[in-house]
Each structure stands twice: as structure tokens, then as C-alpha cells.
């Protein structure tokens, strides 16, 4: 169990590096936006993890970002963010088969409505039971 | 533009709570963290904690027992309160634009703890 | 909590030098890093973040450097406005917590 952790965190920590380079394999990625999504976490450790990913960086004083499958729903009525960006970007996520492009990439400001929590535990928990 | 302008007592007697308002303008506090550092004089700057967009908060770790961090949207005000305040307390107290880095800073608000 | 420990804790350079300044942590932060200049009397003011990207308004001169533990700020062509005290801080984790400091003089 303990190799079959540190296997999973090796391929998220992957994941989350390569996030939005290669337009024609986001299979892992979206995999890993619905784990996000369901599980209601963001990152591995945390949600700062992301921010090394340069696709999703803002600008300067702007550049902490995460995907929108980071963003808490249920944390806010900003129905202007809601129909506009995340409700389209999150109704993908029951389409794991459909390619993306990296113009369709959804972010976030990371300082807004998002999960706070790492998936690590979450995960972990999930594999001790199962 | 972005401006931040924090409002303290000044002078605060040991073992009471100290309260500061942060004012807020040109940004959304409901997407952005508010921070609050403080310098004690001629000392390095110490992080106390943030509130985020969505309401929640972190928290130096020494000090969790001792503060609090809320906000007003409508006000466009963030506040923070520390108790049981001792000599060592006595800081320039700072709001900031911000929760990971610190953007915009206010200009800072002096709290000396004396009797 | 992560400490941060930054070096030297002061330095006296001639306008037109090189400088770097380094800031080590106590475990990986993942660049999770900013730089700030705080001016006697004054308020700090945000160089980097993500422990490479330049800040708004910052001039090009300033440049932000590491990754895992070890970071660091290098000023090329030190002008005299770059004088002030140099803090690191990082945002890893739940916690965040600065550098000491570097003072840093003009000669």
C-alpha cells in the first residue's frame, strides 16, 4: 500500500508539472480534475502546488492561479464567474474523453472561493478503505 | 487603483485586546486574501495570518489562541483582533492586498502596549 | 513552522555593482517565495513571487532565482534606490513566515 501511495503521488505531482503542455494528451489531467472536483480538494499537498504550473500564472502581482476544478461552488453566489467561466468548464468534467486545447484551459484566482485542502489525505483514505 | 489603509489605537494597556481596522479600495474582497504582518521597532517583519476571498482563514501558529481575523464585505473592512496583549505585542501593525504574496501594503499603524 | 534564514544579514556594495542575496528554507517549499524592499520609515514593497516572477513595476535589474530549499534575489547594477532591508518570505503549506532580513548599504 505504501508503494502504491508513493506511485500515485509520483503520477499526480507529474500530472500537475505537465498541466496544459500537451493539448493532444490531457487524459491524466481531466482524470485529475474530476478527483479535484469530487473530492473536493485542490494540489496534492496543497494548493500552491499549482502555481509552478506556468500555463495558469497571471501577471505579476496576479500570478497565483489554480484550474477551476479547484473552485468551491458551494462558497459562492458570484453568479457572474459561475455562468461565464466554471459552470461550462466544470460540466467537461463528466466528458473525460473529449480532447482540450490549451485555450480552453480554466483558471482561477487562488485567493478566491477554492478547496483549501490538499488530495493527499483524501486520497489516501480513500485507498485504506478500498 | 489598489489602496489599503489600516486604523489602530495607538496605545493599549497589557492583558486587553487590541483591535485594528483595515480599509479597503479598488479590489474585491470576495477574490482576494487580506494579510496582516506586523514589524516590532527596528525588528523583522512577522506574518500574524490571512483571510481569504471565501471567508476562511489562516493563522500564525504561536498565535492562534490569541487572534482573530474577520471582514465586512459591504464595509470593504477587514479586522483584526489580538488579546491578552503583552509589552512584546508593541508592533507597526500592516494590512496587505494579498494572502501567498503581499502586493499592496498599507502604511502601517504604531500599537505601543504600556500601562 | 518552515523557518526561513537569510544571508548576509547586511552588505555594503558601490552603486553600479552586483549583488545576491540568498534565503534558505528548513524544508522544500516548492518556490512558493517572495522577495520584498522595505525603505527605512516605509512600508514593504513586493519584488517577486513564485520565487522568479517579477512583480508589477519592478525594473528588470531585480531577479528571483531557486528552487526546493535554496533561493536567491540578485540585483545587476546596483542604483542608488536600491537601498533598504531585503526580506524573503514563503507561502508553503498552511503557515507563512520571512526571512530576518538583509541590510543592504550603499558604499
Known amino acids: 500500500r505504501a508503494q502504491l501511495e508513493r506511485s500515485l503521488r509520483d503520477v499526480v505531482e507529474k500530472t500537475i508539472q505537465k498541466y496544459g503542455t500537451n493539448p493532444e494528451e490531457t487524459a491524466a489531467e481531466e482524470s485529475w480534475d474530476y478527483v479535484q472536483f469530487q473530492l473536493r480538494c485542490c494540489g496534492w499537498h496543497y494548493p500552491q502546488d499549482w502555481f509552478q504550473v506556468l500555463i495558469l500564472r497571471g501577471n505579476g502581482s496576479e500570478a497565483h492561479r489554480v484550474p477551476c476544478s479547484c473552485y468551491n461552488l458551494s462558497a459562492t453566489n458570484d453568479s457572474t464567474i459561475l455562468d461565464k467561466v466554471i459552470l461550462p468548464q466544470l460540466s467537461r468534467l463528466g466528458h473525460l474523453a473529449r480532447s482540450r486545447h490549451s485555450a480552453d484551459i480554466c483558471a482561477v484566482p487562488a485567493e478566491s472561493h477554492i478547496y483549501r485542502e490538499g488530495c493527499a489525505q483524501g486520497l489516501q483514505k480513500w485507498l485504506h478503505n478500498n | 487603483q489598489v489602496q489599503v489603509q489600516e486604523s489602530g489605537p495607538g496605545l493599549v494597556a497589557p492583558s486587553q485586546t487590541l483591535s485594528i481596522t483595515c480599509t479597503v479600495s479598488?479590489?474585491?474582497?470576495?477574490?482576494?486574501?487580506v494579510s496582516w504582518v506586523r514589524q516590532p521597532p527596528g525588528k523583522g517583519l512577522e506574518w500574524l495570518g490571512v483571510?481569504?476571498?471565501?471567508?476562511?482563514?489562516n493563522y500564525h501558529s504561536s498565535l492562534k489562541s490569541r487572534l482573530s481575523i474577520k471582514k465586512d464585505h459591504s464595509k470593504s473592512q477587514v479586522f483584526l483582533k489580538l488579546n491578552s496583549l503583552t509589552a512584546a505585542d508593541t508592533a507597526t501593525y500592516y494590512c496587505?492586498?494579498?494572502?501567498?504574496?503581499?502586493?499592496?501594503w498599507g502604511q502601517g499603524t504604531l500599537v505601543t502596549v504600556s500601562s | 513552522d518552515i523557518q526561513m534564514t537569510q544571508s548576509p544579514s547586511s552588505l555594503s556594495v558601490s552603486v553600479g555593482e552586483r549583488v545576491t542575496i540568498t534565503c534558505r528554507a528548513s524544508?522544500?517549499?516548492?518556490?512558493?517565495l517572495a522577495w520584498y524592499q522595505q525603505k527605512p520609515g516605509k512600508s514593504p514593497k513586493l519584488l517577486v513571487n513564485?520565487?522568479?516572477n517579477l512583480a508589477d513595476g519592478v525594473p528588470s535589474r531585480f531577479s528571483g532565482s531557486g528552487s526546493g530549499t535554496d533561493y536567491s534575489l540578485k540585483i545587476n547594477s546596483l542604483q542608488p534606490e536600491d537601498f533598504g532591508t531585503y526580506y524573503c518570505?514563503?507561502?508553503?503549506?498552511?503557515?507563512?513566515?520571512f526571512g530576518q532580513g538583509t541590510k543592504l548599504e550603499i558604499k
Open positions: 524544508e522544500n517549499i516548492r518556490s512558493n
Open positions: 496587505a492586498k494579498g494572502g501567498y504574496s503581499l502586493a499592496h
Open positions: 513564485v520565487a522568479t
Open positions: 479598488g479590489f474585491s474582497l470576495t477574490t482576494s486574501g
Open positions: 518570505q514563503h507561502y508553503w503549506g498552511t503557515t507563512w513566515t
Open positions: 483571510i481569504w476571498g471565501d471567508g476562511s482563514t
